[in-house]
């Protein structure tokens, strides 16, 4: 006696018109509505009445179209596991967490569950930039030509060598991958170790 326009409707082949928003209820052999994100099943459908949905209570959520009789409990980001919050829990979405600065995800089970400190990159190298921060440990790559990095650090970036001429100075010692260029005043005498070379 229920028209076909809306659930519940009979289904002989156990499939429903809209798999995302409907489900097959085997007891009555009918298709019923799922509850939208942010809600849960307050009353299962019957042969004459569709699923009744209710809003998730505070501090709980359901992310998908569902036929769950409860909402999932919101969980905080665990700082002991190195996680921090980037977006709060809503009725439609769980708390969004990421690894704290200087950490990477060491354990992944659908989402990150445990972060560890990023490895240091030695002088002369820097961490390769990743698409997503905190996704993996550092992969250290040498500074490109004309750049240096002089610390052991998980996050320090290679910097360009100082151009002495831009400051009205002259180069006293060239830069390396681990050190900057040494500049001096053009009128300054050469350091003692270089004075012999100058006399020649």
């Amino acid at each position: 006696s229920q028209p076909q326009a809306v659930p519940p409707y009979a289904s002989e082949n156990q499939t429903c018109r809209d798999q995302e928003k409907e489900y097959y209820e085997p007891q009555h052999r009918i298709c019923c509505s799922r509850c939208p994100p942010g809600t849960y099943v307050s009353a299962k459908c019957s042969r004459i009445r569709d699923t009744v949905c209710a809003t998730c209570a505070e501090n709980s959520y359901n992310e998908h179209w569902n036929y769950l009789t409860i909402c999932q409990l919101c969980r905080p980001c665990d700082p002991v596991m190195g996680l921090e919050e980037i977006a709060p829990c809503t009725s439609k979405r769980k708390t969004q967490c990421r690894c704290q600065p200087g950490m990477f995800c060491a354990a992944w089970a659908l989402e990150c569950t445990h972060c560890e400190l990023l490895s240091d990159c030695p002088p002369g190298t820097e961490a390769e930039l990743k698409d997503e921060v905190g996704k993996g440990n550092n992969h250290c790559v040498p500074c490109k030509a004309g750049h240096f990095q002089n610390t052991s650090s998980p996050s320090a970036r290679c910097q360009p060598h100082t151009r002495c001429e831009n400051q009205g100075l002259v180069e006293a010692a060239p830069g390396t991958a681990q050190s900057d260029t040494t500049c001096k005043n053009p009128l300054e005498p050469l350091p003692p170790e270089m004075s012999g070379t100058m006399l020649m």
Epitope: P8, S46, I48, R49, D50, C53, A54
Partner: antibody, heavy 126, light 107 residues
């Protein structure tokens, strides 16, 4: 607090169409689980269920009267309208509308008409 | 279509006595889908029991419902003067039809 009130003609002639309006307050027919039903009671006789409309647009009709009944809702006006064609003197009765969908103290939903209107008496006579 | 048969049609009892009203379905119901109403003369019905055995807020605990499948019972443990009325069962399993009612009258 939920209230419902029926309105419509008190007297109709045989073969005419009866149109009854149920105006309600205290709930919305767009809320999941809500329904409004129509029930009638001839003088000195038992209750007879006629039709029900749910929040999602689902409609149910008494099998014995299905061909004569139409139920519609106007969510914005908080109204449900029942039309019954080809009226006959045996259709003389008190017509009630009722809210369907009961929530218990724990927030669980149950089927049942928990609040009724006062009823409106309709007499079918030439 | 499920037919609900209520018995007895009339029950003559005195205040303080126990009343047992029966509602029988022509085919098995899911028990959650049976409700009971009380109707007094000149008044609209009042929901008395939902889900076959649960009482709404404000309904005295002398009213109780039980049963499953095809046989359901409404019991009034000790009749009060205001309990003399007509009682209807209704099913929500397939369609929503009522039983024919049981009148509880003063003996």
């Amino acid at each position: 607090q939920i209230t419902l009130k029926e309105s419509g003609p008190t007297l109709v002639k045989p073969t005419q169409t009866l149109t009854l309006t149920c105006t309600f307050t205290g709930f919305s027919l767009s809320t999941s689980g809500m329904g409004v039903g129509w029930i009638r009671q001839p003088p000195g006789k038992a209750l007879e269920w006629l039709a029900l409309i749910y929040w999602n647009g689902g409609k149910l009709y008494s099998p014995s009267l299905k061909n004569r009944l139409t139920i519609t809702k106007d969510t914005s006006k908080n109204q449900v309208v029942l039309t019954m064609t080809n009226m006959d003197p045996v259709d003389t009765a008190t017509y009630y509308c009722a809210h369907s969908g009961y929530y218990d103290n724990s927030g669980y939903y149950w089927d049942g008409m928990d609040v009724w209107g006062q009823g409106t008496t309709v007499t079918v006579s030439p | 279509e499920i037919v609900l048969t209520q018995s007895p049609v009339t029950l003559s009892l005195s205040p303080g006595e126990r009343a047992t009203l029966s509602c029988r379905a022509s085919q098995s119901l899911i028990s959650d889908y049976l409700v009971w109403y009380q109707q007094k003369p000149g008044q609209a019905p009042r929901l008395l029991i939902y889900g076959a055995s649960s009482r709404p807020t404000g309904i005295p605990d002398r009213f109780s419902g039980s049963g499953s499948g095809t046989d359901f019972t409404l019991t009034i443990s000790r009749l009060e003067p205001e309990d003399f009325a007509v009682y209807y069962c209704q099913q929500y399993d397939t369609s929503l039809n009522f039983g024919g009612g049981t009148k509880v009258e003063i003996k």
